[in-house]
Interface confidence: medium
């Protein structure tokens, strides 16, 4: 798409022009004060020393005061991520300040020069907030900066130069490349403000990593394990866009961290919550559902100050779409035998029933693999709020789905070709819902009956003892 | 490079309705904001309200905030500018123009569109 | 709604002179913006934020004010710039335009 003009004109614009039509000299990062939720309004321009905008454009000096910078931009002008944030903000925080950091011109740049850029644009927003701080009722502990890409560095620079100590820094998605394995002072840091969240939706272990994967705030998380978000995958874009490209799907990804954040600010009646893990392989074996020791948090901007003594990486699964929230379920199936197993991996379903809903049919994901005599735990999530759980039923896929199975299967029959039934014995489920943080126990509805093979199915309801509580915090209530 | 291609002139009687088309080419079509603005014969611009085509938000003028439905079809880059309950003064060329958020200028015109209200 | 007048209707100059343009707002806007229009066509940006120039606008044309008083300046007038000004506020909706002056050749 072509470049329009910037509020600054293009940097071409300016290289080239003469002289005599430029009536002042623009700097490169400017401060837009957003005086309203509608992108049509332009707002106020505020600039050091300048005390007139501050009071003709109401800067209220004793509320929250919001910065947003952008990153690194292909097109030149600001995208629509930027308005929806500014509105979401101005609808939850109706007396705040909210002021878009334009440094447009030193962003529409390659890539490795609007980075050299950061510390310089870092620096203009210490010395806007040092100004600020010169005022009466200003307070540094009101300042949020919420930093998209490579504005998140920004924002830890700004945070870094500040004189004093700024409230709070979010990081949406921090950029990766050329940041990965940096020195703390030369990318965002949890020493850059009071407290440091971080969300990380665009990681990846093989190739080009757009956003950052190494934590770098008090709390990090890393919604779908941080790389492939739903609704994001070709299909999704091609599907939505009639020019849905690859390059689609990476905005898709790495945008997604501003919709959670837009998401939190306006559902805030349905949070999201994230859960504490060493990683996101134990998080998707459903291991790390536990609030205890504020091992949970909400994410965006609700989430609750924590100033860990390291980096807490936090994960969660999330919907495709607004609102993001999703009903986290713990299940710990304990095997006590099993035969005729094979080389290969049961494929398992199970079937959530409530008071409110009953959930799809969702699959087991087997990390690793299944253990006999052993507790098998895995996550599974819901879209909707079931309520109460009442019963449960699991399914045992019959004809394999994927030719891997297959092969595996045929491979098998030949080694042992008169390879009697496979067979599993499960006598009880154990569900805690990451939400509630409640514990139950689910037994076979017929006790004697505690076997599943292939193309079966078994259902267990509530045992009678109901449901067990354990002293665990809910995430619904504050943490400390 | 960046146009705004407008639908033809329209004859409409009193009290019927007229559905003016901008069909947006050359950028990415739901990064701006769409405004149409009127202009009667001989006299000043007015503006009437605008559309984000990349989720659908709308803003009115007060003065047609019930005659006017502004919508778009992101499929083929097009926004629309729906009068109802056309009356004689409603006798303008309605343009259609390209803003971008937060830069704050109409940078790219429709061409325009006549609209004749005559029983 | 925020009114703008402009002032005068009709400038009736020769060209090579320097045209002086009015616009006023009923309260105080932060920025003002200036178009060019000439029969049978649309609108044309020449101003944006007061007092820059959009691309490919020559240099005779500048703007200032702020406040309530904002003024468009033709340095020189040139054949092609025989046309009507309008100008323009985005401080608050609904968004205003002047009633325009017609710059004619005397």
């Known amino acids: 798409s072509p470049v329009p003009f910037g509020p600054e004109g293009r940097l071409e614009d300016k290289l080239h022009k003469p002289k005599a039509t430029q009536t002042e000299v623009k700097p490169s990062v400017r401060f837009n004060l957003r005086t309203s939720k509608d992108p049509e309004h332009e707002g106020c321009y505020l600039s050091v020393g300048h005390s007139q905008p501050l009071e003709d454009c109401s800067f209220n000096m004793t509320a929250k005061t919001f910065f947003i910078i952008h990153g690194w931009t292909m097109s030149g002008i600001f995208e629509n991520w930027l308005h929806k944030l500014v509105s979401a903000l101005h609808t939850r925080e109706k007396d705040a300040n909210v002021v878009v950091v334009d440094w447009l011109p030193l962003a529409h740049q390659l890539y490795t020069d609007a980075v050299n850029n950061t510390r310089v644009v870092g620096h203009s927003i210490a010395r806007m907030l040092d100004w600020l701080q010169e005022k009466d009722d200003f307070s540094l502990g009101n300042v949020h900066l919420i930093g998209y890409s490579l504005g998140a560095h920004v924002a830890g620079y700004a945070g870094n130069f500040v004189k004093g100590t700024v409230g709070r820094i979010t990081g949406l998605d921090p950029a990766g490349p050329m940041f990965e394995g940096a020195d703390i002072h030369k990318r965002l840091s949890p020493d850059d403000a009071d407290f440091v969240d971080v969300l990380h939706t665009y990681t990846r272990s093989f190739g080009l990593s757009i956003g950052i994967q190494m934590p770098v705030g008090h709390i990090d998380i890393y919604p779908n394990g941080g790389d492939f978000q739903p609704g994001c995958g070709l299909n999704d874009v091609l599907g939505s866009i009639a020019y849905g490209t690859i390059t689609e799907v990476v905005k898709c990804e790495h945008e997604r961290a501003v919709h959670l954040f837009v998401d939190s600010l306006v559902n805030q009646d349905k949070p999201s919550f994230a859960f504490q893990c060493t990683d996101s392989n134990r998080f998707k074996k459903g291991i790390c559902l536990s609030c205890r020791k504020n091992r949970c948090n909400s994410i965006g901007y609700n989430a609750k100050k924590m100033r860990n003594k390291r980096n807490s990486k936090m994960y969660l699964k999330t919907r495709a779409g607004m609102p993001f929230r999703v009903y986290h379920y713990q299940m710990k199936i304990h095997v006590f035998s099993y035969k005729n197993m094979g080389e290969i991996e049961p494929t398992f379903y199970v079937t959530l029933y409530g008071t409110n809903a009953d959930s799809q049919t969702l699959p087991l994901e087997i990390v690793e693999r299944i253990e006999q005599n052993a507790t098998n735990t895995f996550l599974v999530y819901t879209e909707e709020d079931l309520g109460d759980l009442l019963k449960i039923q699991l399914t045992w896929e019959g004809a394999s789905q994927s030719w891997y199975n297959l092969w595996k299967e045929f491979r098998s029959y030949l080694s042992q070709p008169r390879n009697p039934g496979r067979e599993l014995n499960i006598r009880r489920i154990r569900v805690k819902s990451g939400e509630t943080q409640r514990k139950l126990t689910f037994c076979t509805e017929d006790p004697e009956n505690t076997s599943i093979s292939p193309g079966r199915e078994l259902w267990f309801r509530k045992c009678r003892d109901g449901w067990r509580m354990k002293n665990e915090t809910s995430p619904t209530v504050e943490l400390p | 490079q960046v146009q705004l291609v407008q639908s033809g002139a329209e004859v409409k009687k009193p009290g019927a309705s007229v559905k003016v088309s901008c069909k947006a080419s050359?950028?990415?079509?739901?990064?701006?904001?769409m405004h149409w603005v009127r202009q009667a014969p001989g006299q000043g611009l007015e503006w009437m309200g605008s559309?984000?085509?990349?989720?659908?938000?709308?803003s009115y003028n007060e003065k047609f905030k019930d005659r006017v439905t502004s919508t778009r079809d992101t499929s083929i880059s097009t926004a629309y500018m729906e009068l109802s309950r056309l009356r004689s003064d409603d006798t303008v060329v309605y343009y259609c123009?390209?803003?971008?958020?937060?830069?704050?200028?109409?940078?790219?015109w429709g061409q325009g569109t006549t609209v004749t209200v005559s029983s | 709604e925020i009114v703008l007048t402009q002032s005068p209707g009709t400038l009736s100059l020769s060209p090579g002179e320097r045209a002086t343009l009015s616009c006023r707002a009923s309260?105080?806007?932060?920025?003002m913006y200036w178009y060019q229009q000439k029969p049978g066509q649309a609108p044309r940006l020449l101003i944006y934020?007061?007092?820059n120039l959009a691309p490919g606008i020559p240099d005779r044309f500048s703007g200032s004010g702020s406040g309530t008083d904002f003024t468009l300046t033709i340095s020189r007038l040139e054949p092609e710039d025989f046309a009507v000004y309008y100008c323009q506020q985005f401080t608050s909706s609904p968004y205003t335009f002047g009633g325009g002056t017609k710059v004619e050749i005397k």
């Open positions: 309260s105080s806007v932060h920025y």
């Open positions: 123009a390209r803003y971008g958020n937060y830069v704050g200028y109409f940078d790219y």
């Open positions: 559309i984000n085509p990349y989720y659908g938000g709308t």
């Open positions: 934020y007061t007092s």
């Open positions: 050359g950028y990415t079509f739901t990064e701006y904001t």
